[in-house]
């Protein structure tokens, strides 16, 4: 069954998926889709890479890691409850039926207000919901915490500015990883 990852509304959600290229720069096409992995390809494709680059992506979906080294983990920006669901990471290894498929379950929960410490007054005057880090266990994602009821542009900008580069490292062990070659 799929591994479950969690985030709160307004955060950036992180779905880990990795492979090890046979040689540096020897990349394998990858697709991400919303919905469980079908027999071939990805359904409802949100992002795709080829042997060289990201060649298709849709708004709010991007690769934050170094995909040239096989980190094809998906970041979904500024999530809402409707982003909940199963996501498919498909490593499209050449050959018949060689693809590696990973189904990852993303569950979005409502954001929670955390009372702001007084020393954060300047920040919370503009953004009254404090940012915290919420861990959800080793097999689940850790993401930036609650955000205020502000407009989507503010949330998106703030989330981008506050992305924590540790998250990818923390999750590498629990994410989907395969070695090629």
């Amino acid at each position: 069954s799929e591994v479950e990852y969690r985030a709160e509304v307004g955060q950036n959600a992180y779905l880990p998926c990795f492979y090890t290229p046979a040689a540096p720069g020897n990349l394998v096409p990858v697709c991400w889709g919303k919905g469980a992995c079908p027999v071939f390809e990805c359904g409802n494709v949100v992002l795709r890479t080829d042997e060289r680059d990201v060649n298709y992506w849709t708004s709010r979906y991007w690769l934050n890691g170094d995909f040239r080294k096989g980190d094809v983990s998906l970041t979904i920006e500024n999530v809402t409850l409707a982003d909940s669901g199963i996501y498919c990471c498909r490593i499209q290894i050449p050959g018949i039926m060689n693809d590696e498929k990973f189904n990852l379950k993303l569950v979005i929960k409502p954001a929670k207000v955390t009372p702001a410490p007084t020393r954060q007054r300047d920040f919370t005057a503009a953004f009254p919901r404090m940012l915290t880090t919420r861990g959800h266990g080793p097999a689940e994602t850790q993401t930036l915490g609650s955000l205020p009821d502000i407009n989507l542009t503010q949330i998106s900008t703030l989330a981008n500015e506050l992305r924590d580069s540790r998250l990818a490292n923390d999750l590498r062990d629990s994410g989907a990883t395969i070695r090629i070659g």
Epitope: T80, L81, A82, S84, G85, V107, I108, K109, P110, K112, D149
Partner: antibody, heavy 119, light 107 residues
Framework: QGQLQQPGAEVVKPGAAVKLSCKAS????????MQWIKQRPGQGLDWIGE????????DYNQNFKGKATLTVDTSSNTAYLQLSSLTSEDSAVYYC????????????WGPGTLVTVSS | DILMTQSPSSMSVSLGDTVSIICHAS??????IGWLQQKPGKSFKGLIY???NLEDGVPSRFSGSGSGADYSLTISSLESEDFADYYC?????????FGGGTKLEIK
């Protein structure tokens, strides 16, 4: 998917308070947020608020702040809606509803409790 | 608050017909919409969530579509048990808000 049980009716006097219950069974109570909704004939549906049974965190509709209080008792898998200072405007059917597996907030509904405010 | 404008408020239809109910939100709700059914004198049943997904046990004759601020619920090949009230609800923003409802009646 589980069940939500609510008493059928409550009759209360103006100015009094009432505590409505919603007993959950057949699922992990603390894993899913609970919503409360008010329905008055000819007035449509009003969202009152929601509560996370895992930590008692609540979100309220500003229109119901001071009127409604949401709580849970995890030992009995029961969510509660307390309504205070009741008036005839509070006469309505009150529903609890819980979220589904993929964060669908209004997936499963209780049968509702009819509250009648009358002297 | 986000205003959910639902239309029509009522419609008379025949068994076997296909019907669509529309909900227009006062702003983009990014598919954060559900559709609910209420039979006379009864409680509610969730039909559709996140715009297009069927809740467990809901027949495939129900479907949801839409994006941005405009969404619809379609019921194909209406059966007798489908005559009921239908509501949309948005949950992209607090407070959650509901459409005014659509009453499906037998012609």
């Amino acid at each position: 998917q589980g069940q939500l049980q609510q008493p059928g009716a409550e009759v209360v006097k103006p100015g009094a308070a009432v505590k409505l219950s919603c007993k959950a069974s057949g699922y992990t109570f603390t894993s899913y947020w609970m919503q409360w909704i008010k329905q008055r004939p000819g007035q449509g549906l009003d969202w009152i608020g929601e509560i996370d049974p895992s930590d008692n965190y609540t979100d309220y509709n500003q229109n119901f702040k001071g009127k409604a209080t949401l709580t849970v008792d995890t030992s009995s898998n029961t969510a509660y809606l307390q309504l205070s200072s009741l008036t005839s405007e509070d006469s309505a059917v009150y529903y609890c509803a819980r979220e589904g597996a993929f964060s669908s907030p209004f997936a499963y509904w209780g049968p509702g409790t009819l509250v009648t405010v009358s002297s | 608050d986000i205003l959910m404008t639902q239309s029509p408020s009522s419609m008379s239809v025949s068994l076997g017909d296909t019907v669509s109910i529309i909900c227009h939100a006062s702003q983009d709700i990014r598919s954060n919409i559900g559709w609910l059914q209420q039979k006379p004198g009864k409680s509610f049943k969730g039909l559709i969530y996140h715009g297009t997904n069927l809740e467990d046990g809901v027949p495939s004759r129900f479907s949801g579509s839409g994006s941005g601020a405009d969404y619809s619920l379609t019921i194909s090949s209406l059966e007798s048990e489908d005559f009921a009230d239908y509501y949309c609800v948005q949950y992209v923003q607090f407070p959650r808000t509901f459409g005014g409802g659509t009453k499906l009646e037998i012609k």
